[in-house]
């Protein structure tokens, strides 16, 4: 596959991943009420996110409440907020870096410098995916640990919400997209060493016999 095709595919995956990450960040479904027993009649389901919690009645009526105080939030929610927002913003920066390094744009003159910019964009997307993965996995670990903790009240046990799965899918897209962008930049240079410009040697003159030197052929 050509480097331009790799760049386009990588950028598309990163953009979809970025959108998924924004969706995961905003959705109030990081954790949902666990239905452990059917003999305890639960008339409502609780959804909890990074910014608000929602109560869904059995009638279908939903009421959401935005968290009032930042200080009242648990450590994992505060950390997840900071890291996911950072990942979203970093992806925004990575978009402009990638576009600047793309072969179809003229922001940077074609050549090794442009390839390095494209590579930087890919690396930023990779880092962005890893950055988003930290709060997702940390949050999931806490939810699972509390689910199996016999000291936690049954009504306070939660299951992994849709937002976590969307987030994981988004991080996978960001990282795969980032890898493709890096590969595209790599292919574009035609050599692994990106720190020096390519040196060209002058074409060899024909020999006295009028033949080309055999050393010129592989």
């Amino acid at each position: 596959m050509g480097s331009a095709a790799l760049e386009i595919l990588g950028l598309v995956l990163c953009l979809v991943g970025w959108g998924g990450l924004i969706l995961a960040c905003g959705l109030p479904m990081w954790q949902v009420t666990a239905f452990l027993d059917h003999n305890i009649v639960t008339a409502q389901t609780t959804w909890k996110g990074l910014w608000m919690s929602c109560v869904v009645q059995s009638t279908g009526h939903m009421q959401c409440k935005v968290y009032d105080s930042v200080l009242a939030l648990s450590t994992e929610v505060q950390a997840a907020r900071a890291l996911t927002v950072s990942a979203v913003l970093l992806a925004f920066v990575a978009l402009f870096v990638t576009l600047a390094g793309a072969q179809c744009t003229t922001c940077v003159a074609p050549g090794p410098a442009k390839a390095r910019v494209a590579l930087t964009g890919g690396v930023l997307y990779l880092f962005c995916g890893l950055l988003a993965l930290v709060p997702l996995c940390w949050f999931a670990n806490i939810v699972v640990r509390e689910f199996y903790d016999p000291s936690v009240p049954v009504s306070q046990k939660y299951e992994l919400g849709a937002a976590l799965y969307i987030g994981w899918a988004a991080t996978a897209l960001l990282m795969v997209g980032g890898c493709l962008l890096c590969c595209g930049a790599w292919v574009c240079t035609g050599r692994p060493d990106l720190s020096f410009p390519v040196k060209y040697s002058a074409p060899r003159r024909p020999t006295a016999t009028g033949d080309y030197d055999k050393k010129n052929y592989v």
């Epitope: 027993d37 003999n39 016999p150 009504s155």
Partner: antibody, heavy 116, light 112 residues
């Protein structure tokens, strides 16, 4: 295992009071802790619980918004900050170790009287 | 909230007698996951704080004499003292340890 409460006494309605509970004989941070109160009128009544590190707190509806349970694992101490006290909060308050949603070790209790 | 109803509230007993205390809950708290009944029994002797005797309806705490027997399932539970001793004079409470708010029965007072 030993838990010792302190800080009780007589307080006027609407005022505040803070109870403390010093724990020893076990690894404090390995356990949920709780406050349970007992009055002749209501009998034994669970008040509040707190998880290992203090990041999760649970309250009985009548004390929600008025009482705050907290802990200091470095000092192996549990606290109950009681604000806007009412006459119905008059009781003996017990600090208890709280594994598996049980109350397996209780303190001797501290009397809190809310009266004008 | 789960309401715990104990009966009788008072019982006059003799040493050596078999004593039965009942506890009824307003709803079942049998866990469908592990088939456990989250019911505990506590003993409170005069002037003392409560002491945990039994949890999960029938599991005795270490150091609790085997004359204390817990039984029952669903919404009906029983604490049986197979041979009443003088030191067993106390108030006995049942408690559901399934979910918040954790609720106790009003107690059963045993006197000789």
């Amino acid at each position: 295992v030993k838990v010792v409460e302190s800080g009780g006494g007589l307080v006027q309605p609407g005022r505040s009071m803070k109870l403390s509970c010093a724990a020893s004989g076990f690894t404090f941070s390995d356990y949920f802790m709780a406050w349970v109160r007992q009055s002749p009128k209501k009998g034994l009544e669970w008040v509040a619980s707190i998880n290992y590190g203090g990041s999760r707190t649970y309250y009985e509806d009548s004390v929600k918004g008025r009482f705050t349970i907290s802990r200091d694992n470095a000092k192996s101490t549990l606290y109950l900050q009681m604000n806007s006290l009412r006459s119905e909060d008059t009781a003996t308050y017990y600090c208890a170790r709280h594994p598996h949603r049980l109350f397996d070790y209780w303190g001797q209790g501290v009397m809190v009287t809310v009266s004008s | 909230d789960i309401v715990m109803t104990q009966s009788p509230s008072f019982l006059a007993v003799s040493v050596g007698e078999t004593v039965t205390i009942n506890c009824k809950s307003s709803q079942s708290f049998l866990s469908s996951g592990n088939q456990e009944n989250y019911l505990a029994w506590y003993q409170q002797k005069p002037g003392q704080s409560p002491k945990l005797l039994i949890h999960l309806a029938s599991t005795r705490e270490s150091g609790v004499p085997d004359r204390f027997i817990g039984s029952g399932s669903g919404t009906d539970f029983t604490l049986t003292i197979s041979s009443m001793q003088a030191e067993d004079v106390a108030i006995y409470y049942c408690q559901q340890h399934y979910d918040i708010p954790y609720t106790f029965g009003a107690g059963t007072k045993l006197e000789l």
